[in-house]
Amino acid sequence: EVEKTACPSGKKAREIDESLIFYKKWELEACVDAALLATQMDRVNAIPFTYEQLDVLKHKLDELYPQGYPESVIQHLGYLFLKMSPEDIRKWNVTSLETLKALLEVNKGHEMSPQVATLIDRFVKGRGQLDKDTLDTLTAFYPGYLCSLSPEELSSVPPSSIWAVRPQDLDTCDPRQLDVLYPKARLAFQNMNGSEYFVKIQSFLGGAPTEDLKALSQQNVSMDLATFMKLRTDAVLPLTVAEVQKLLGPHVEGLKAEERHRPVRDWILRQRQDDLDTLGLGLQGGIPNGYLVLDLSMQEALS
């Protein structure tokens, strides 16, 4: 806390300029009018204030706007944004995408801080949904942003926004998140032709059900093993050997290297060894010939 002291003669700031970098903290407190600071916030970022001087400027704004800063000030915070706490940011009402971009720019190249997370949360809640422009902006600054959202939060993403998603944006998503995103992606890309559709939908397939994988197997898509390994185990298990062969195309040979890992391991256990042998890959662990397979889940459904 800076002590209240009178401003020395001749030092009263008439505008926010570089001369202020030579002011001691108490002089900044005494000689800079908060209202002047608020109207000239756009200048602050161009002036190399020390971090301790920025603390004083923040204190002045806090006193002027105890209920939270107006957007006209927020948009020009620049480096001062780094001084804000999540509690400060929760008081803000940020509606402009330009304001959001300006503040994300300050934090660019760093991990998402609690301040940024709070800012994004406030912005998205204010908009009511995660529209395409917002998603474009957020994933540009934070490729992992989408996967940081809960399935409930992802449900507010409109299908049209899915066009903004790049494969790397989904790298850290878990199956529960892909379960929410996949149907949106399917809807978003539904009017594309086979090969183009597969290129777009591929990153989302970790949320695809069995029937969609069966449909893809009829389209010569040649899914790579990395994508196959991210599929839901429960969606892969009902696929036949023939369907997996069609789904993977020339990549089917990669199954051998993955035979000990899910979902390949579990899928092998469900196939007849006869059928696995037709692949000529030496996959072992299938159901021996002559054994009868009872699908107990089907039996329960019938009774």
Partner: nanobody
Framework: EVQLVESGGGLVQPGGSLRLSCAAS????????MGWFRQAPGKGRELVAA????????YYPDSVEGRFTISRDNAKRMVYLQMNSLRAEDTAVYYC?????????????????????WGQGTQVTVSS
Amino acid sequence: EVQLVESGGGLVQPGGSLRLSCAASGRTFSYNAMGWFRQAPGKGRELVAAITWRGGYTYYPDSVEGRFTISRDNAKRMVYLQMNSLRAEDTAVYYCAAATARVYADDSYLNESGYDYWGQGTQVTVSS
């Protein structure tokens, strides 16, 4: 890397004048501030003048106010210190310094902690 080279020091009589020059070379970018510090025998470094690189705003402590004038020539990357009405107590090694990074220390452009590049110094002796 930034190199700072001072020149212009020497022996001068009380009441006389000297003009120190500081040539900056190396990385070309806009500094936050440039300063002149001095260090008398057995004492710490003290700031005698500072100037912002972009706007040319200046700062002087009371001890030299009205006697010393700092200026800069951005195109030549030079900083000057015009010293008039010199006194015996102005005798010291004078250093040129550049502040290039946003810094943490309290009142940092007013003390040496705020400056990250330094020259070797030039001796100024005021004596009759």
